[in-house]
Structure formats: structure tokens, C-alpha cells
């Protein structure tokens, strides 16, 4: 807290400029008008103030706006943003994407601080939903943002926003999240043609049901093994050998290297050995010829 002292004669700041870097903390407090500071915030970033001096400037703004800063000030905070606490930020009403971008730019290269986390939460809540432009901005700065949202939060993401999602944004999404995102992606990309559709939907396929995988197998998509290995085991199990062969195309040979891993391992156990042999890959562990296969799940459903 800076003591209230009168401004020395001739030191009253007529504007925010470089001369202020020579002011002591108490002089800044006494000689810089808070309203002037608020209207000339854009100049602060160009002046090499010390951290102590920035503390004084923040204090002046806090006194002027005890209920929280207006967006006109927030947008030009620049490095002063790094001085804000989550409690300060909770008082703000940030509605402009330009303001959000400006503040995230200041924090670029830094980690996801509690301040930034609070800012993003305030912004998204204010918008009411995660629209495409917001998602575009957030994933550009923090590629893992989407995968940090709960399935419940993701359910309110409109399908149109999915266009902003890049494959790397889904790197750390778990199966529960992909279960929510996949139907949205399917809806978003539904008007694309076969090959273009597959390129876009590929990253989301960890949430795809069996019937969609069967449909894809009819479209010569040549799914790579990395994508196949991320599919839901329960979605892969009902696929026939012929369907998997069509789904993977030339990549089917890769099954051999993955035969001990899920979902390939579990899928092999469900196939007739005769059918597996038609692939000519030496896959072992299928159901021996002559054995009767009972679908117990169907039996339970009927009883």
C-alpha cells in the first residue's frame, strides 16, 4: 500500500510517457491521475516500468474501478495483466474476442496460469457457449484446451465449432470425451464427400460406433493402424474379417504387429480362425473350426 502524499510542484503527469520511469513509487501514486491512466493504458506497454511501478499503476486502477475494470481498459492492460489475481479477473466482464486474444498474447510462452484459467472461464461463461471463433483462439494458444473439458461441458459445444478442431487438439482426449465429440463431428462434416470426410472425421473416430465403422469399410478409406488402434474395443469386436480388411485396405498387414494389443487382440478372439487365415497374416487365437459361437449378450437381452 502506497502512502497518500501530495504531488510535488511541476511533477503532475500531463500524459503517460517515458518520463514516468524516473518517478519514485510515491510520486507515481501522487502525480498520475487514475482516469488519465485508464484512457492511456495502451501507452503503458511501450514504457519499461519496473514491477514495483506496475504495482502502483495497478493500485490506481483498482481504486478507480473497485467493481472491476471496464473492457476498454482490460483490452489494453498488456503486461499489467500478469499482475492481476484470479480474484481481480472474476470481477471483469470480457465479451470481446479481441480482448481475450490480446491478453492471451501477453501470456504467450508462459504456462497456463490461474489468471489465464480464470480469464478463459469468465469469457466462455459470458459467451454462453464455446463458439467456433473462441475455440479456434483457445486451441491456438492451448492445444490441450478442448480435452480439458468434461463430457458434460463438451455436450454444449455446437457442431459448427468442430470445424476449428485440429488433430493435435484431440491428442489427450479420453474415450468419454470422444464419445461426445464424435457425433458432433459427424454432423459437422456430413456434407463432405467420402475421402474429404474421412480426413476430417479420422481424429474423432475413437468415439465411433460399430455401424459407422461398417459404413466406412464400404468407402475405400484405407484407415491407418494408428487410427484403428484408437477405436473403441466394443465398436471393433462385431466387425467381420472382411469388414476390417476393407476398412484398413493396404494397412491390413499391420494387424500382425498389433495382434497382442487391444483392440486387435480382443477382435481376433472373436473371429473364426478360418476367416483370419484368409488374410494370410498368420494371425492366431481365433475360434477353432467346428466350435459353436454363442452370443451371450444377445441371449441376456432376450431373457
Amino acid at each position: 500500500e502506497v502512502e497518500k502524499t501530495a504531488c510535488p510542484s511541476g511533477k503532475k503527469a500531463p500524459e503517460i510517457d517515458e518520463s514516468l520511469i524516473f518517478y519514485k513509487k510515491w510520486e507515481l501514486e501522487a502525480c498520475v491521475d487514475a482516469a488519465l491512466l485508464a484512457t492511456q493504458m495502451d501507452r503503458v506497454n511501450a514504457i519499461p516500468f519496473t514491477y514495483e511501478q506496475l504495482d502502483v499503476l495497478k493500485h490506481k486502477l483498482d481504486e478507480l474501478y473497485p467493481q472491476g475494470y471496464p473492457e476498454s481498459v482490460i483490452q489494453h492492460l498488456g503486461y499489467l495483466f500478469l499482475k492481476m489475481s484470479p480474484e481481480d479477473i472474476r470481477k471483469w466482464n470480457v465479451t470481446s474476442l479481441e480482448t481475450l486474444k490480446a491478453l492471451l498474447e501477453v501470456n504467450k510462452g508462459h504456462e497456463m496460469s490461474p489468471q489465464v484459467a480464470t480469464l478463459i472461464d469468465r469469457f466462455v461463461k459470458g459467451r454462453g457457449q464455446l463458439d467456433k471463433d473462441t475455440l479456434d483462439t483457445l486451441t491456438a494458444f492451448y492445444p490441450g484446451y478442448l480435452c480439458s473439458l468434461s463430457p458434460e461441458e463438451l455436450s454444449s459445444v455446437p457442431p459448427s465449432s468442430i470445424w476449428a478442431v485440429r488433430p493435435q487438439d484431440l491428442d489427450t482426449c479420453d474415450p468419454r470425451q470422444l464419445d461426445v465429440l464424435y457425433p458432433k463431428a459427424r454432423l459437422a462434416f456430413q456434407n463432405m464427400n467420402g475421402s474429404e470426410y474421412f480426413v476430417k472425421i479420422q481424429s474423432f473416430l475413437g468415439g465411433a460406433p460399430t455401424e459407422d465403422l461398417k459404413a466406412l469399410s464400404q468407402q475405400n478409406v484405407s484407415m491407418d493402424l494408428a487410427t484403428f488402434m484408437k477405436l473403441r474395443t466394443d465398436a471393433v469386436l462385431p466387425l467381420t474379417v472382411a469388414e476390417v480388411q476393407k476398412l484398413l485396405g493396404p494397412h491390413v498387414e499391420g494387424l500382425k504387429a498389433e495382434e497382442r494389443h487391444r483392440p486387435v487382440r480382443d477382435w481376433i478372439l472373436r473371429q473364426r480362425q478360418d476367416d483370419l487365415d484368409t488374410l494370410g497374416l498368420g494371425l492366431q487365437g481365433g475360434i477353432p473350426n467346428g466350435y459353436l459361437v454363442l452370443d451371450l449378450s444377445m441371449q441376456e437381452a432376450l431373457s
Epitope: 508462459h110 504456462e111 497456463m112 496460469s113 490461474p114 489465464v116 484459467a117 492451448y142 492445444p143 490441450g144 484446451y145 480435452c147 480439458s148 473439458l149 468434461s150 463430457p151 458434460e152 461441458e153 493435435q168 491428442d171 489427450t172
Partner: nanobody, 111 residues
């Protein structure tokens, strides 16, 4: 780049318990949640548990009821409490947050 450090792994008998920790460096906020994945010898990486931004949690069916994920925002740390450990839980456990990954901690369950 966010640094994540896992700890708490070790050798434990089947039926025993361990608590893994994942701590984020510097001023990073764990308020954006984190996940635990694991990779067993000769197997693909698989998801174990998540704590999401809003504080809700999710678990793979294989660990549901046995493992509990939690976070301490003041300590920038996410925990994985593992009870009733089984032989098949043997793996290297990795923590991830905001697309960053830790180096992993080895958990070995013996009979």
C-alpha cells in the same frame, strides 16, 4: 512448455495400494484438469482416469471402483489413489495436462 513430474510408483503386492502424484511446474494451474494413462509391457498406451476442468471425473471400466483421481489446486498436483491392485495394473503410469506429458512412474504389482 509445461513440466509435469510423476511420483509415488513402486513395487506392491496384489491387493495393495499406492498413491501416485503428478505435480505441475511453476505457476501452472491444474484447474484445467489432468489425466492418467498407462502403458504395460508390450501393450499400447491406455487411458486410466481423468479429472476435468469442472472437477468431474471419469474412469476406464477396468479401474472403476478401485482407483480415485483427485486434485489439489493449491499444490498444483493431481493424485491417483490405486487400491485393490491387480497384476494387470503393472505398467508405467503417465500424467498429462494441456497436451504436455510427464516422464512416467513405474508401478509393479507382484503376486
Amino acid at each position: 512448455q509445461l513440466q509435469l513430474v510423476e511420483s509415488g510408483g513402486g513395487l506392491v503386492q496384489a491387493g495393495g495400494s499406492l498413491r501416485l502424484s503428478c505435480t505441475a511446474s511453476g505457476s501452472t494451474s491444474m484447474s484445467y484438469g489432468a489425466k492418467w494413462f498407462r502403458r504395460a509391457p508390450g501393450k499400447e498406451r491406455e487411458w486410466v482416469a481423468s479429472v476435468y476442468r469442472d472437477g468431474t471425473t471419469g474412469y476406464d471400466d477396468s479401474v472403476k471402483g478401485r482407483f480415485t483421481i483427485s486434485r489439489d489446486l493449491a499444490k498444483n498436483t493431481v493424485y491417483l489413489q490405486m487400491n485393490s491392485l491387480r497384476l494387470e495394473d503393472t505398467a508405467v503410469y503417465y500424467c498429462t495436462a494441456l497436451n504436455s506429458w510427464g516422464q512416467g512412474t513405474q508401478v509393479t504389482v507382484s503376486s
